[in-house]
Amino acid sequence: DIIMRPSCAPGWFYHKSNCYGYFRKLRNWSDAELECQSYGNGAHLASILSLKEASTIAEYISGYQRSQPIWIGLHDPQKRQQWQWIDGAMYLYRSWSGKSMGGNKHCAEMSSNNNFLTWSSNECNKRQHFLCKYRP
């Protein structure tokens, strides 16, 4: 049997049954999530569920830039350090950098400090690039 690889929306990239869109627009976390949703297909800010997925994403983004942090779909909506993925994925894989999780930092970004392989918490109102994800 011939199995066709699903296609992603123009400008998005495919990896292991998911499509990813990296947007070099400046949005706060909630506006970024709204924009991801606006693309349809059940898209949300991206969940990152394995080292392999993280490495693939990091390699892709590094081809565009290496200095700007990028919002992902991990947040702490109750502000109690109870982190969850906005797309409902299980929060099992973790890749936090050693930076403090305190203060008013309840949204997660891929940090440019370690080539986008680790995450940092940041204030949700900051305007940053963002990564969307959906399953085609």
């Epitope: 627009k25 400046l26 706060n28 909630s30 506006d31 709204l34 008013n104 204030e123 949700c124 109102n125 900051k126 305007r127």
Partner: antibody
Framework: QVQLQESGPGLVKPSGTLSLTCAVS?????????WSWVRQPPGKGLEWIGE???????NYNPSLKSRVTMSADKSKNQFSLKLSSVTAADTAVYYC???????????????WGRGTLVTVSS | QSVLTQPPSASGTPGQRVTISCSGS????????VNWYQQLPGTAPKLLIF???QRPSGVPDRFSGSKSGTSASLAISGLQSEDEAVYYC????????????FGAGTKVTVL
């Protein structure tokens, strides 16, 4: 009620550096806002210069980026603008403003300083 | 040359309805919300409309905003003498590194 007040020299020599400070009262610059600078040449329209977050993150107008530096001083609850290599074309009223996020999406400048006129002349 | 295009002037008699247009592109109005500012003579700009159609508290409901595609408009119904001012549209622009852009302003005259 948040209030903003610009201060700095009203006269700057050509090729020099324009330096302005915006003092914030009635609110903290450590709040979840951006703090921006906008200028208006005499008789002309508004031009966005750039913005700063309290942690020092900045976004600048691409047309001015090479000459602009912004900083924030949380201890003094103020933020500053430096514009280098000025010419007569930089003569303008300079306003500082607070940018707030909307709950429906987007941002807007909800509080403005009164503005200060800076003239570039020898 | 402003990124957002507004007519330089508009006018009306007291009680009339005046509409100001603001035309942009997919990188600004097309993908971001629009704000409107009022600048009375000799004063700082004042927020009039935010997020396309929202009025801050204290702004009369005579002022309304709308957006469609890459254009936006501000309507002033029941024009009053104190509405004589310059009105600016503004929006975030996603081109280059991202920046905030203003229209050149529309001077509204109450005849």
């Amino acid at each position: 009620q948040v209030q903003l007040q610009e201060s700095g020299p009203g006269l700057v020599k050509p090729s020099g550096t324009l330096s302005l400070t915006c003092a914030v009262s009635g609110g903290s610059i450590s709040s979840s806002n951006y703090w921006s600078w906008v200028r208006q040449p005499p008789g002309k329209g508004l031009e966005w210069i750039g913005e700063i977050y309290h942690d020092g993150s900045t976004n600048y107008n691409p047309s001015l980026k090479s000459r602009v530096t912004m900083s924030a001083d949380k201890s003094k609850n103020q933020f500053s603008l430096k514009l280098s290599s000025v010419t007569a074309a930089d003569t303008a009223v300079y306003y500082c403003a607070r940018d707030s996020p909307s709950y429906s999406s987007g941002w807007y400048s909800d509080y403005w300083g009164r503005g200060t006129l800076v003239t570039v002349s020898s | 040359q402003s990124v957002l295009t507004q007519p330089p002037s508009a006018s009306g008699t007291p009680g009339q309805r005046v509409t100001i247009s603001c035309s942009g592109s997919s990188s600004n109005i097309g993908s971001n919300t629009v704000n409107w500012y009022q600048q009375l003579p000799g004063t700082a700009p004042k927020l009039l409309i935010f997020s396309n159609n929202q009025r801050p508290s204290g702004v009369p409901d005579r002022f309304s905003g709308s957006k469609s595609g890459t254009s936006a408009s501000l309507a002033i119904s029941g024009l009053q003498s104190e509405d004589e001012a310059v009105y600016y549209c503004a929006a975030w622009d996603d081109s280059l590194t991202g920046f905030y852009v203003f229209g050149a302003g529309t001077k509204v005259t109450v005849l």
